[in-house]
Interface confidence: medium
């Protein structure tokens, strides 16, 4: 069992871990969660630079997940779709970390309780039935590099005045990806 990740002490006070989040759930092929540079989120069969993640505790049991290479935060839209954002929105990008007895973890959006899943073979809008939570095994990565790149752990504050704080943010600059000019 990955004892370090099971220790409740690591869920307090801004504890930072570098991990690969690996899933072998029946609904998925074996894959590591990957945050890509253009904001897409997918699964990589092998560990890749884009799948090395930094997990930082925000408060007991709640974390933010940052792609180390791409400096993008893992975030989730209300429909469950995942994306990588350049900016940290506490509502969209905070995840509750639930530790299972077998060393696996389950993650769910703190704001709307949706479980974290790798994108499946269907659009999130077209899943025939809701799936149970995906189990992820946090595999050790390299220790955090020092000094950390500026701005990664002190991101731009969210637009708390936004009329739609759960809309997709980041490279699309506050718009849903309609690809309009």
């Amino acid at each position: 069992h990955p004892i370090p990740d099971s220790s409740p002490l690591l869920q307090f006070g801004g504890q930072v871990r570098q991990r690969y989040l690996y899933t072998d759930d029946a609904q998925q092929t074996e894959a590591h969660l990957e945050i890509r540079e253009d904001g897409t989120v997918g699964g990589a069969a092998d560990q890749s630079p884009e799948s090395l993640l930094q997990l930082k505790a925000l408060k007991p049991g709640v974390i933010q997940i940052l792609g180390v290479k791409t400096s993008r935060f893992l975030c989730q839209r209300p429909d469950g779709a995942l994306y990588g954002s350049l900016h940290f929105d506490p509502e969209a990008c905070s995840f509750r970390e639930l530790l299972l007895e077998d060393g696996y973890n389950v993650y769910q959006s703190e704001a709307h309780g949706l479980p974290l899943h790798l994108p499946g073979n269907k659009s999130p809008h077209r899943d025939p039935a809701p799936r149970g939570p995906a189990r992820f095994l946090p595999l050790p990565g390299l220790p955090p590099a020092l000094p950390e790149p500026p701005g990664i752990l002190a991101p731009q504050p969210p637009d708390v005045g936004s009329s739609d704080p759960l809309s997709m943010v980041g490279p699309s600059q506050g718009r849903s990806p309609s690809y309009a000019s």
Epitope: T29, R36, E37, D38, G39, T40, G42, A44, K69, T70, S71, Y83, L86, P119, G120, N121, S123, H125, R126, M168, G170, P171, S172, Q173, P177, Y179, S181
Partner: antibody, heavy 117, light 106 residues
Framework: QVQLQQSGAELARPGASVKLSCKAS????????ISWVKQRTGQGLEWIGE????????YYNEKFKGKATLTADKSSSTAYMELRSLTSEDSAVYFC??????????WGQGTTLTVSS | QIVLTQSPALMSASPGERVTMTCSAG?????MYWYQQKPRSSPKPWIY???NLASGVPARFSGSGSGTSYSLTISSMEAEDAATYYC?????????FGGGTKLEIK
């Protein structure tokens, strides 16, 4: 509005190198990737690679490693692609395109490269 | 790399006719993207994330599919729809395009 303005047509000799440019305007250059796509006459589209100006990270199609080199100049919001050791197989139209969430949402007008002796 | 096979390679349709073209992936992909290209022009973004229409795309177009099978449908063919349509994936590197379906007007 978002625009990607590509450099003009190029005529090059076999074995030579060329550097194509793509000047972006109308958006924050460092917030998106720039991909390059090849299209030979009457053929389909082929992804060459991509650069993210914010980090200068590059990703290549294995087929084009050693052939293409992607760079970006943040100060002028311009992306470049250098093609080396040119052969007739490199004669094509090359497009630059902006990448947003896996989608190529804006395209340049294309640069025609002709390799001939 | 994931090979995308579009079929048919060439098709023609009369105005008002319903048109469906397919894109088959060599292995499962999460989403499909589509582009329209007319002669001597750059490709235009057409459908993203399998089923969402890009800005300015007429509502007669739709996209669907999952896994290894995706399709683009035009509910009622119009003359301006004559073009070549390409599918594209980025579930794994490298990004790949299909060979295209050329749609002509009868």
């Amino acid at each position: 509005q978002v625009q990607l303005q590509q450099s003009g047509a190029e005529l090059a000799r076999p074995g030579a190198s060329v550097k194509l440019s793509c000047k972006a305007s109308g958006y924050t250059f460092t917030n998106y990737g720039i991909s390059w796509v090849k299209q030979r006459t009457g053929q389909g589209l082929e992804w060459i690679g991509e650069i993210y100006p914010r980090s200068d990270n590059t990703y290549y199609n294995e087929k084009f490693k050693g052939k293409a080199t992607l760079t970006a100049d943040k100060s002028s919001s311009t992306a470049y692609m250098e093609l080396r050791s040119l052969t007739s197989e490199d004669s094509a139209v090359y497009f630059c395109t902006r990448s947003d969430y896996g989608f190529f949402d804006y395209w340049g007008q294309g640069t025609t490269l002709t390799v001939s002796s | 790399q994931i090979v995308l096979t579009q079929s048919p390679a060439l098709m023609s349709a009369s105005p008002g006719e319903r048109v469906t073209m397919t894109c088959s992936a060599g292995s499962s992909v999460s989403y499909m993207y589509w582009y329209q290209q007319k002669p001597r022009s750059s490709p235009k973004p057409w459908i993203y994330l399998t089923s969402n229409l890009a800005s300015g795309v007429p509502a007669r177009f739709s996209g669907s599919g999952s896994g290894t099978s995706y399709s683009l449908t035009i509910s009622s063919m119009e003359a301006e729809d004559a073009a070549t349509y390409y599918c594209q994936q980025w579930s794994s590197n490298p990004r790949t395009f299909g060979g295209g379906t050329k749609l002509e007007i009868k």
